[in-house]
């Protein structure tokens, strides 16, 4: 059985302040069953950036239609980027459980923020 892969194709993305940033992530399989979540940073202090089930993330939207069947694209778009958004973003697959268990993380995409052109 092939092992699930979480693919973040870009190592880094540079965006001008005020613009939107697209962070790409795809998975190689629909199973194991369980959600995808996005975080900024790694380790216990990481910040949850997007999880469809819980929380309110007004600046974050999925790139693909959330109602699309059997879709393996979990890319997100973050609007109105500010310098405070800089950091490394990880797309993380969880195995469903009580609680869900982290299964595999993408390699991360570093977001850098350029000054807004005057």
């Amino acid at each position: 059985e092939e092992e699930l892969q979480v693919i973040q194709p870009e190592k880094s993305v540079s965006v001008a302040a005020g613009d939107s940033a697209t962070l790409n992530c795809t998975v190689s399989s629909l199973i194991p069953v369980g959600p995808i979540q996005w975080f900024r940073g790694a380790g216990p202090g990481r910040e949850l950036i997007y999880n469809l089930k819980e929380g309110h993330f007004p600046r974050v939207t999925p790139v693909s239609d959330p109602t699309k069947r059997n879709n393996m694209d979990f890319s997100i778009r973050i609007s109105n980027i500010t310098p405070a958004d800089a950091g490394t973003y990880y797309c993380v697959k969880f195995r469903k459980g009580s609680p869900d268990v982290e299964l595999k993380s993408g390699a991360g995409t570093e977001l850098s923020v350029r000054a807004k052109p005057s």
């Epitope: 059985e1 699930l4 399989s29 629909l30 199973i31 194991p32 069953v33 369980g34 959600p35 995808i36 469809l52 089930k53 999925p62 693909s64 959330p66 109602t67 699309k68 069947r69 059997n70 879709n71 393996m72 694209d73 979990f74 195995r95 469903k96």
Partner: antibody
């Protein structure tokens, strides 16, 4: 065309065992979670168990008695049922899971079911 | 466990008429709700998922609506093949997946 064909049902005494099979065709079986749902005579639908790859999930009513498994090389889903009770009497359906990307699973194809009767 | 309550349990409708029935969830399930049709002696068939999206091949007379805790399935102009039992299912929070108790649509 997606097809799911259950087999292995029958009459068994309380405390007995039975193994159900579900032969799948028409889709990439190994790429999808698959599920057993049952329906007692004249009653509604009750989820029994789901398997992904190595991950398995059970209803409380069958936990510890039933075991779900799959053989991707044979495109077949199984349900091993032990310590059967009268209340396990039902038509057992296998179903293919379909996933809405950011969300959960529902069941887009169903077999015709196999009847399990637990009676002395 | 999320409990789904369907009402009415039985609906008597004349062919050609409109049928509307509901599914209420005991807690918010957002749009993670599916509807199935089960004709006598047959397996269930997926009609609607994500509360409102018709499965491929399902006639336009079937429509789903609602979100959160209140959902509705509407069948406009009932055909003879639509007389069946209809079940809702939530997939927001599982295990367990849960189904409603069903609504039987019978000929008036």
């Amino acid at each position: 065309e997606v097809q799911l064909l259950e087999s292995g049902g029958g009459v068994v005494q309380p405390g007995g065992s039975l193994r159900l099979s579900c032969a799948a065709s028409g889709f990439s079986f190994s790429n999808f979670a698959v599920t057993w749902v049952r329906q007692a005579p004249g009653k509604g639908l009750e989820w029994v168990s789901t398997i992904g790859s190595g991950d398995t999930y059970y209803a409380d009513s069958v936990k510890g008695r039933f075991t779900i498994s799959r053989d991707n090389s044979k495109n077949t889903l199984y349900l091993q049922m032990n310590s059967l009770r009268a209340e396990d009497t039902a038509v057992y359906y296998c179903a293919k899971d379909s996933t809405v990307s950011w969300s959960g699973d529902f069941f887009d194809y169903w077999g015709q079911g196999t009847l399990v009767t637990v009676s002395s | 466990e999320i409990v789904l309550t369907q009402s009415p349990a039985t609906l008597s409708v004349s062919p050609g008429e409109r049928a509307t029935f509901s599914c209420r969830a005991s807690q918010n399930v957002k749009n993670d709700l599916a509807w199935y049709q089960q004709r006598p002696g047959q397996a269930p068939r997926l009609l609607i998922y994500a509360a409102r999206i018709r499965e491929t091949g399902i006639p336009e007379r079937f429509s789903g609506s609602g979100s959160g805790t209140e959902f509705t399935l509407t069948i406009t102009s009932l055909q003879s093949e639509d007389f069946a039992v209809y079940y809702c299912q939530q997939y927001y929070d599982w295990p367990p997946f849960t189904f409603g108790g069903g609504t039987k649509v019978e000929i008036k």
